[in-house]
């Protein structure tokens, strides 16, 4: 807290410019206006003051603005944001996609800190979904920012915003996260041909269920095995032999160097050790020749 | 990279004048506070003066106001210390300081850690 002192003759700023870069603490206090420093805010950023003298300025604001600032004010913040609280942010009403940005200009490069969680999070509820030209904006800024989101909150994801989505988005994201954004994506893409499908839907496809791979196997996509090793191991151990080679085109040799690991171990132990040797790959620890399979989910599905 | 660089030092009788000034290279002036400090031997650096990005304020401690006088012309990329009056506790050596960064300092402006570019100095005497 800044002591209440009288501004000295000569130093009442008539305006906010450089010239208070030289002033202390208690002279920014003394001398300058709250209600000069709401209405020239957008000057603050262009004026390289410290730390401590942006302390200054915010406390003329909280006092101005003791319910929390107006978006004129929080459009400007600058570098003045990185002082703010989350418990100032949770006051603030922004609506406008325009602010969004330059607050979260000023973070650039930096992780995601609690007061752009809190902003970010204040300003989609107040839209009440996340619309396409905000998930840009986010992912533009925060690549990782769709995989922060629980299953509950991607449910208010509206197809269309999946257009926005880049393959390095969905890179830390979960199976639940991919349950809930492959429908989505499946229907934003609905309309497209095949080829181009693939390449978009690609990255969702952690999400997929059996039925949908089984589709793609009949569309010569050759999907790679980074992919394939994305996929619901509850998905992939219905394919046959014969889907798999199909879905993997040329990229089914790479299931060598994968048979150790999931969803490629579980699949291989559910399929017939002959067909798995009609791929030619000396894949190991499929079912042994003369084996009797009984599938004891569907026994229990009928009893 | 920036590169700041010194010249008008020397030797000059009490109460004589010395213009002092900072060629900087390799970024433009017109963001930047920029500072003249100090440092006489066995002592620490000391700010003599300092001036905000575009001219229109100017700092000075109590031992220099009135006798010195910083100034700068950011077409040239050149930031001027105008001495007079000078005394032999002005003795030292005079380093011209910048700071580029544009975020926020730590520190304040009248402290070295807020300058980020420095020059290699230049000796300035004050003997009779």
């Known amino acids: 807290e800044v002591e209440k002192t009288a501004c000295p003759s000569g130093k009442k700023a008539r305006e906010i410019d450089e010239s208070l870069i030289f002033y202390k603490k208690w002279e920014l206090e003394a001398c300058v206006d709250a209600a000069l420093l709401a209405t020239q805010m957008d000057r603050v950023n262009a004026i390289p003051f410290t730390y401590e003298q942006l302390d200054v300025l915010k406390h003329k604001l909280d006092e101005l603005y003791p319910q929390g600032y107006p978006e004129s004010v929080i459009q400007h913040l600058g570098y003045l944001f990185l002082k703010m609280s989350p418990e100032d942010i949770r006051k603030w009403n922004v609506t406008s996609l325009e602010t969004l940005k330059a607050l979260l200009e000023v973070n650039k490069g930096h992780e995601m800190s609690p007061q752009v969680a809190t902003l970010i999070d204040r300003f989609v509820k107040g839209r009440g979904q996340l619309d396409k030209d905000t998930l840009d904006t986010l992912t533009a800024f925060y690549p990782g920012y769709l995989c922060s989101l629980s299953p509950e909150e991607l449910s208010s994801v509206p197809p269309s915003s999946i257009w926005a989505v880049r393959p390095q988005d969905l890179d830390t994201c979960d199976p639940r996260q991919l349950d809930v954004l492959y429908p989505k994506a499946r229907l934003a893409f609905q309309n497209m041909n095949g080829s181009e499908y693939f390449v978009k839907i690609q990255s969702f496809l952690g999400g997929a269920p059996t039925e949908d791979l089984k589709a793609l196997s009949q569309q010569n996509v050759s999907m790679d095995l980074a992919t394939f090793m994305k996929l619901r191991t509850d998905a992939v151990l219905p394919l046959t032999v014969a889907e798999v080679q199909k879905l993997l085109g040329p990229h089914v040799e790479g299931l060598k160097a994968e048979e150790r690991h999931r969803p490629v171990r579980d699949w291989i132990l559910r399929q017939r050790q002959d067909d798995l040797d009609t791929l030619g790959l000396g894949l190991q620890g499929g079912i042994p020749n003369g084996y009797l399979v009984l599938d004891l989910s569907m026994q229990e599905a009928l009893s | 990279e920036v590169q700041l660089v010194e010249s008008g030092g020397g030797l000059v009788q009490p109460g004589g004048s010395l213009r002092l000034s900072c060629a900087a290279s390799?970024?433009?002036?017109?963001?930047?506070?920029m500072g003249w400090f100090r440092q006489a031997p066995g002592k620490g650096r000391e700010l003599v003066a300092a001036?905000?990005?575009?001219?229109?304020?100017?700092y000075y401690p109590d031992s220099v106001e009135g006798r010195f006088t910083i100034s700068r012309d950011n077409a040239k990329r050149m930031v001027y210390l105008q001495m007079n009056s000078l005394r032999a506790e002005d003795t030292a050596v005079y380093y011209c300081a910048a700071r580029f960064a544009p975020d926020p300092a730590f520190s304040v402006y009248w402290s070295e850690n807020y300058y980020d570019y420095w020059g290699q100095g230049t000796q300035v005497t004050v003997s009779s």
């Open positions: 001036i905000t990005p575009r001219g229109s304020g100017t």
């Open positions: 390799g970024r433009t002036l017109s963001s930047n506070v």
